[in-house]
């Protein structure tokens, strides 16, 4: 019994005066607490308590469940205890089979003994299976067996407390260890689509998938720069142990323009947090925006190829596309395809392939596209660059020499005189009249230029050259002069094309 100095309050004394007492099942337990300021007896086993206000605790017929710690407390709060074992060969263990362990922490298998004199108090696997090699434990007959540093691999481990009694192994009831994992990484979050485009009144629904080791992971949908509570629905699955998946679905049944913005799926656990965002754009009606990928005014050389290319954004999806020239619709020579295979793609490409263009094929080429809400179009003005062609070269009745040439860009006509038999005509002659004539062909066709000179200016035999040229090339026509006396002979025109 404890001893204290005179004058100081002392703890109560208990009879019998020993720390442990062993009684047989069916025998009497009689414990006396002596203290002038006696308050109560408390009995505790498996962390449950009972109280008794009598100073003598009497149990006439002891049962195994009377095993436990008996504590007497006085009015000063001082106490003294005795541990009683009620030896029952039929019930060697008292148990509480609730067994939870936190990863990396210790956990107690609650199987205190009713007989401290048994041996080899330990843990055993169920059905004769061995325990994990790294499982360490510390037995305490009054409390149970402490498993040290629980591992995730021990989850759903089946255990028995075990003792040897009279040479035989005796097992307790089964314990199933349920391990709560420690978070050792942030949650993994992903979103069904990174962006959404909707018309007013359509339903917005987006799903966030959260993956972690347990359902204790926290997740929520948040609207950036807003505290508004969003309506979410959840589905969750355990794909085996420590592989938990939750799908959090956010829905706005009838989206409005002012619902547009960035929505964040946020998840956190005790290790850290992760988030992913999706962007919602709500438009009051659908749209089509066309972007030419080349200049809408196109210059191309005669006989060459050109591709007219547009990109366009269409929402909802485009329903009709066509290329038109001179009120005729192309049935081939063009292709239309989505810019990407992404589910949320709204960008498309259309290409018209014009091959070996002729000078007569210049003009306006129009791309038209429509969806259920709008129509849109874009026009390309195509000019075919052609080398000048001399249409006519004549001596007029008034003595004028006239040269008419067509080409694109507009040809320039220069005149040259070559005296005698010289091949090179270098002396330029100024025209009397130059006119650009209106072409009777389609717009964007060749431009026609007419130039005239006065033949009376020439006094000697020779050749007059009419040279028509532009950026593409040049062409010449020649007039030959022969004088007999004072009379000018017939002028013989001929042409010589030069590249």
């Amino acid at each position: 019994q404890p001893s204290v100095s005179p004058g100081e309050p002392s703890p109560p004394s208990i009879h019998p005066g020993k720390s442990d007492l062993i009684v047989r099942v069916g025998d009497e337990i009689r414990l006396l607490c002596t203290d002038p300021g006696f308050v109560k007896w408390t009995f505790e086993i498996l962390d449950e308590t009972n109280e008794n206000k009598q100073n003598e605790w009497i149990t006439e017929k002891a049962e195994a469940t009377n095993t436990g710690k008996y504590t007497c407390t006085n009015k000063h709060g001082l106490s003294n205890s005795i541990y009683v074992f009620v030896r029952d060969p039929a019930k060697l263990f008292l148990v509480d089979r609730s067994l939870y362990g936190k990863e990396d922490n210790d956990t107690l298998v609650r199987c205190p003994l009713t007989d401290p004199e048994v041996t080899n108090y330990s843990l055993k696997g169920c059905q004769g299976k061995p325990l994990p090699k790294d499982l360490r434990f510390i037995p305490d007959p009054k409390a149970g067996i402490m498993i040290k540093s629980v591992k995730r691999a021990y989850h759903r481990l089946c255990l028995h407390c075990s003792v040897d009694q009279e040479g035989k192994s005796v097992l307790s009831e089964k314990f199933i260890l349920k391990v709560r994992p420690a978070f050792k990484a942030v949650p993994v979050v992903s979103v069904s689509k990174a962006s959404y485009l909707l018309r007013e009144g359509e339903e917005f629904t987006v799903t966030c998938t959260i993956k972690d080791v347990s359902s204790s992971v926290y997740s929520t949908w948040k609207r950036e720069n807003s505290q508004t509570k969003l309506q979410e629905k959840y589905n969750s699955w355990h794909h085996g142990d420590f592989n938990y998946e939750r799908q959090a679905t956010l829905t706005i049944s009838s989206a409005r323009v002012n619902d547009s913005g960035v929505f964040m799926c946020y998840a956190n656990n005790t290790f850290g947090s992760a988030n992913v965002t999706t962007t919602l754009e709500v438009v009051d009606k659908g749209f089509i925006n066309i972007f030419p990928m080349i200049n809408t005014t196109v210059f191309v050389n005669d006989g060459e190829n050109v591709d007219l290319i547009v990109e366009y954004e269409a929402f909802p999806k485009p329903e009709h596309q066509q290329w038109i020239y001179m009120n005729r619709t192309f049935t081939d020579k063009w292709e239309d395809y989505p810019k990407s295979e992404n589910e949320s793609n709204i960008r498309y490409v259309s290409e018209l392939h014009l091959t070996r263009l002729k000078g007569t094929e210049g003009g306006t080429y129009t791309f038209l596209v429509s969806n259920s809400d709008v129509n849109a179009a874009i026009a390309f003005n195509v000019y075919v660059n052609t080398k000048p062609e001399i249409l006519t070269y004549d001596r007029l009745v008034n003595g004028m020499l006239q040269c008419v040439a067509a080409g694109f860009p507009e040809p320039t006509i220069d005149w040259y005189f070559c005296p005698g038999t010289e091949q090179r005509c270098s002396a330029s002659v100024l025209p009397v009249d130059v006119q650009t004539l209106n072409s009777s062909g389609p717009p964007f066709g060749k431009l026609v230029v007419q130039s005239s000179i006065d033949s009376s200016a020439f006094k000697h035999n020779g050749t007059v050259e009419c040279k028509a040229y532009n950026d593409v090339g040049k062409t010449s026509a020649y007039f030959n002069f022969a004088f007999k006396g004072n009379n000018k002979e017939q002028i013989h025109p001929h042409t010589l094309f030069t590249p």
């Epitope: 505790e44 509480d96 089979r97 609730s98 359902s215 204790s216 355990h238």
Partner: antibody, heavy 117, light 111 residues
Framework: QVQLVQSGAEVKKPGASVKVSCKAS????????MHWVRQAPGQGLEWMGV????????SYNQKFKGRVTMTTDTSTSTAYMELRSLTSDDTAVYYC??????????WGQGTLVTVSA | EIVLTQSPSSLSASVGDRVTITCRAS??????????MHWYQQKPGKAPKLLIY???NLESGVPSRFSGSGSGTDFTLTISSLQPEDFATYYC?????????FGQGTKLEIK
């Protein structure tokens, strides 16, 4: 003699929060898990979550995720359950229940929470 | 989550009758042959009271006319001879897997 004594009935407005207490006696408070279960009028029982013994870890039913918080005060052997953003659907009797030997062997008397505008 | 479906949802019986209530789980609640299934009784305005734990164990203080059986996904609560105080609502509950779940209840009424 294990006892769980809960706080009294509460009337709350939609959007408010409620915090129900559950004072335990007759056992070592830190040695047992405490669960919370609710029952709407005329309906069945619904598990809300658990606060584990020892370190205060929690596990919540995802239905209440983000709205519920379970805590304990070991100095007074009291468990608490707070539910936020209340709606009329949260009108129910809320019970605390101690888990012992795998089952809910002890229950509080229940706390009626009425959510009404 | 594990869904528990009780049948019947309600039942009329007389004092002295033998009554059986079944509870079917959407997946097994067993681990190593231990069934994490429990049965509770609830009377109006009262907290639930544990009757049977781990499928077949009678809780201390509960009359022996109550018994439980079953394993895996199918479980049964039997009352061998109904007494007047047994008219109440009965719930099965599993705690094999989080979230713990209850059956929808079986209301036992006097015929």
């Amino acid at each position: 003699q294990v006892q769980l004594v809960q706080s009294g009935a509460e009337v709350k407005k939609p959007g408010a929060s409620v915090k129900v207490s559950c004072k335990a006696s007759g056992y070592t408070f830190t040695s047992y898990n405490m669960h919370w279960v609710r029952q709407a009028p005329g309906q069945g029982l619904e598990w809300m979550g658990v606060i584990y013994s020892g370190n205060g870890d929690t596990s919540y039913n995802q239905k209440f995720k983000g709205r519920v918080t379970m805590t304990t005060d070991t100095s007074t052997s009291t468990a608490y359950m707070e539910l936020r953003s209340l709606t009329s659907d949260d009108t129910a009797v809320y019970y605390c229940a101690r888990e012992r030997d795998t089952r809910f062997g002890n229950w509080g008397q229940g706390t009626l929470v009425t959510v009404s505008a | 989550e594990i869904v528990l479906t009780q049948s019947p949802s309600s039942l009329s019986a007389s004092v002295g009758d033998r009554v059986t209530i079944t509870c079917r789980a959407s997946e097994s609640v067993d681990i190593y042959g231990q069934s994490f299934m429990h049965w509770y009784q609830q009377k109006p305005g009262k907290a639930p009271k544990l009757l049977i734990y781990l499928a077949s164990n009678l809780e201390s203080g509960v009359p022996s006319r109550f018994s439980g059986s079953g394993s895996g996904t199918d479980f049964t609560l039997t009352i061998s001879s109904l007494q007047p105080e047994d008219f109440a609502t009965y719930y099965c509950q599993q705690n094999n897997e989080d979230p713990y779940t209850f059956g929808q209840g079986t209301k036992l009424e006097i015929k």
